[in-house]
């Protein structure tokens, strides 16, 4: 008995369905046993589904009730499953196992990694620090959602709406602006992007003079 998954990594959008491929080969014609899928986590194994060749009965892990189904060709060497209504919690590595009681080896397994794709949510832009001439401030940008994890990049425009270079790398967050001055004034756009989408937010920077105590 041998089992293989035809792809190492699968990508599918949140809310959609995905078929996790798994095929098996055996020299026996009798199909008495089980197809099982588990999700392999860092601290535990989570049962996804167990399917009985004889009774055709499904046993689901709690998160998978009625949204996982085994291939119609399960008895013809196809142990693939389809997972519906994908969520971010479905990200991870899955293991397909086929157990046939009449096969000498009984048990065989293979793995596939599922990456659930989610476009970045509109990022939150914020300023850390006091917007006073001479101070250092930090511009932060973060999307609450996004899979794969979003990449962040910054662009800067002056009051005349002309793009200007940034003195530090434009990728990543946060953006540190040192010793701000009237030259720093303008607006800053953060772009959050991944394989499936792009979103942005902007911040206006208007440094004010320090208050004078007489």
């Amino acid at each position: 008995l041998t089992v293989e998954t035809t792809q190492d990594i699968l990508r599918a959008a949140r809310g959609r369905s995905v078929t996790l491929p798994c095929t098996y080969n055996t020299y026996v014609s009798d199909r008495e046993g089980f197809i099982q899928w588990d999700k392999l986590l860092r601290s535990q194994t989570e049962r996804v589904v167990t399917w009985n060749f004889v009774t055709k009965k499904y046993i689901y892990g709690n998160r998978y009730e009625n949204r996982v189904r085994v291939s119609n060709d399960a008895e013809l060497s196809n142990a693939s499953i389809t997972i519906d209504q994908l969520t971010m919690d479905d990200n991870g590595t899955y293991e397909c196992s086929v157990s046939l009681m009449s096969d000498q080896d009984v048990n065989a397994k293979s793995r596939v990694r599922l990456l659930v794709l989610v476009p970045p949510s509109k990022p939150d832009c914020s300023i850390q620090g006091e917007m006073v001439i001479g101070n250092n401030i930090q511009l932060t940008c973060h999307s609450a959602e996004g899979s794969p994890s979003p990449q962040y990049s910054w662009k800067s425009y002056n009051a005349q709406n002309q793009q200007r270079p940034l003195t530090q790398p434009v990728s990543g967050e946060p953006l540190l602006l040192k010793n701000i001055s009237t030259e720093t004034a303008g607006y800053y756009i953060c772009t959050s992007s991944n394989d499936v989408g792009i979103e942005s937010c902007n911040i206006t920077v208007a440094p004010r003079p320090p208050s004078m105590n007489i």
Partner: antibody, heavy 118, light 106 residues
Amino acid sequence: EVQLVESGGGLVKPGGSLRLSCAASGFTFSSYSMNWVRQAPGKGLEWVSSISRDSTYIYYADSVKGRFTISRDNAKNSLYLQMNSLRAEDTAVYYCAREGVAGAFDIWGQGTMVTVSS
Amino acid sequence: AIQLTQSPSSLSASVGDRVTITCRASQSISSYLNWYQQKPGKAPKLLIYIASSLQSGVPSRFSGSGSGTDFTLTISSLQPEDFATYYCQQSYNTWTFGQGTKVEIK
């Protein structure tokens, strides 16, 4: 015949170390996840640790985390449990067990006794 | 961690009796519940897996049922060789065992 045979048990002082072995035969060892389960004298069964067929996924019970290390050598059809910083409460018969359908332990060894005492 | 509570912790029965042991999980474990028999000085032996599947070579007088949190092991007609301790085990989320039920001769 499908068989698991444990060895390496014995008497050890608190704070000491011991390495248990489990020799598998009669099945394709590299196809199965393997486990250690223990049973203190007169008590019930307690799962200790699990290792996937290729050693990628390893799990431990909270009671042994950081002290015990499970490993396997598929070329030698062998499973191991390295036990460090042993305590009196680790005294038990230690069984190795094969993980079958849906996580059930379908084949067990005969067990090896570990006694931690000064 | 998921906890399993077996009841009763011990029972006395006669040969031919119908014996029922229950196991309750602290949260839903679907049908990922297994039953083992252990005799003194011996290793446990798998009887039932995924709640109701009979392990190869186990007599048909043993049966299991249940799903979610409540499970039952039934011995339809107790035989002399069935006097032993029985353990339930969940395999849904790592593994935990029940505390055991000792079946003694009345």
